[in-house]
């Protein structure tokens, strides 16, 4: 089980990396961080970390009320704070593993 | 009303350092990121530093890097700038500014205080 | 860095002229643009923010306009206390955020 969640935080952070060179990596973290309702993967700080994301922007699928450009120059009261691997590790946890 | 009121302004010899504030009141300060911008004596503004709203994000110009620090203390709603290692160059008038960031603009300034470097 | 290059630097007007400022961005902000106005002493007063949109309170004399790259900000009919430096701001790529120089506004 920590091996599998290992592995999914790595993926999850190797995806995000991807996130603005690939449009397909991005729409399927876009439904991740929509349908848990998260952002990042530790918590929406980690977008920031990605070199060829500017600093002030996150997906605007991290937004509570995606619309497009919510994402640029976003307000932390605007978007969903909690990190993607806890939320759909803890799903994981009681559905599949 | 609204009210960004900034203090700790001064007198400061080169090499020295100086902690303003901030005091806000009449809204929800969790609300907004916050930024510190100041103006030397008949030039333009400069963007100094901003901070979100949880304090998790902070950013600094090139210009204050690694001498400058900003802080918030969202049960005082209150904002901090510690400065030190000052230079001529920070002489300026430092505001404190609201920020609602997304598509709106920077729409509540204090009034200003004064840090002059000289020895 | 995104740079913001105003024009013109200053400006000589009178009572009732129509007046124009422009903005530049070294690349495509969109509509992130807002407008602020500073009188001497004082800090600077919000105007227009997302290029177009009039902040509450301020006068419809003012209007701002452009996408993109380019972007204006309109008097459309000038008061005595319209004389001030007005500035324009980029929030699209930060940080840093950056202004424009400034323009002054005098009276002719």
């Known amino acids: 089980r920590d091996k599998v969640m290992s592995e999914f935080n790595n993926n999850f952070r190797q995806q995000m990396e991807n996130y603005p060179k690939n449009n397909h990596t991005a729409s399927i973290l876009d439904r991740m961080q929509a349908d848990f309702k998260c952002c990042g993967a530790a918590n929406y700080t980690d977008w920031e970390k990605i070199p060829s994301m500017s600093k002030n922007r996150v997906p605007d699928s991290c937004c509570i009320n995606v619309t497009v450009g919510c994402g640029i120059n976003f307000n932390e009261k605007a978007i969903h704070k909690e990190g993607c691997v806890e939320k759909i590790g803890g799903w994981l946890r009681k559905n599949v593993l | 009303q609204v009210q960004l009121v900034e203090s700790g302004g001064g007198l400061v010899k080169p090499g020295g350092s100086l902690r303003l504030s901030c005091a806000t009141s009449?809204?929800?300060?969790?609300?907004?990121?916050m930024n510190w911008i100041r103006q030397a004596p008949g030039k333009g503004l400069e963007w100094v530093s901003y901070?979100?709203?949880?304090?998790?994000?902070?950013y600094y110009a090139d210009s204050v890097r690694g001498r400058f620090s900003i802080s918030r203390d969202n049960a005082k709603n209150s904002l901090y700038l510690q400065m030190s290692s000052l230079r001529a160059d920070d002489t300026a008038v430092y505001y404190c500014v609201r920020d609602p960031r997304q598509i709106y603009g920077m729409d509540v300034w204090g009034q200003g205080t004064t840090v002059t470097v000289s020895s | 860095d995104i740079q913001m290059t105003q024009s013109p630097s200053s400006l000589s007007a009178s009572v009732g002229d129509r007046v124009t400022i422009t903005c530049r961005a070294s690349?495509?902000?969109?509509?992130?643009l807002n407008w602020y106005q500073q009188k001497p002493g004082k800090a600077p007063k919000l105007l227009i923010y997302?290029?177009?949109s009039l902040q509450s309170g301020v006068p419809s004399r003012f209007s701002g306009s452009g996408s993109g790259t380019d972007f204006t900000l309109t008097i459309s009919s000038l008061q005595p206390e319209d004389f001030a430096t007005y500035y324009c701001q980029q929030s699209y790529s930060t940080p840093p955020i950056t202004f424009g120089q400034g323009t002054r506004l005098e009276i002719k």
């Open positions: 997302a290029a177009s």
């Open positions: 690349q495509s902000i969109s509509s992130y």
């Open positions: 009449g809204f929800t300060f969790t609300d907004y990121f």
């Open positions: 901070i979100s709203n949880s304090g998790s994000i902070r």
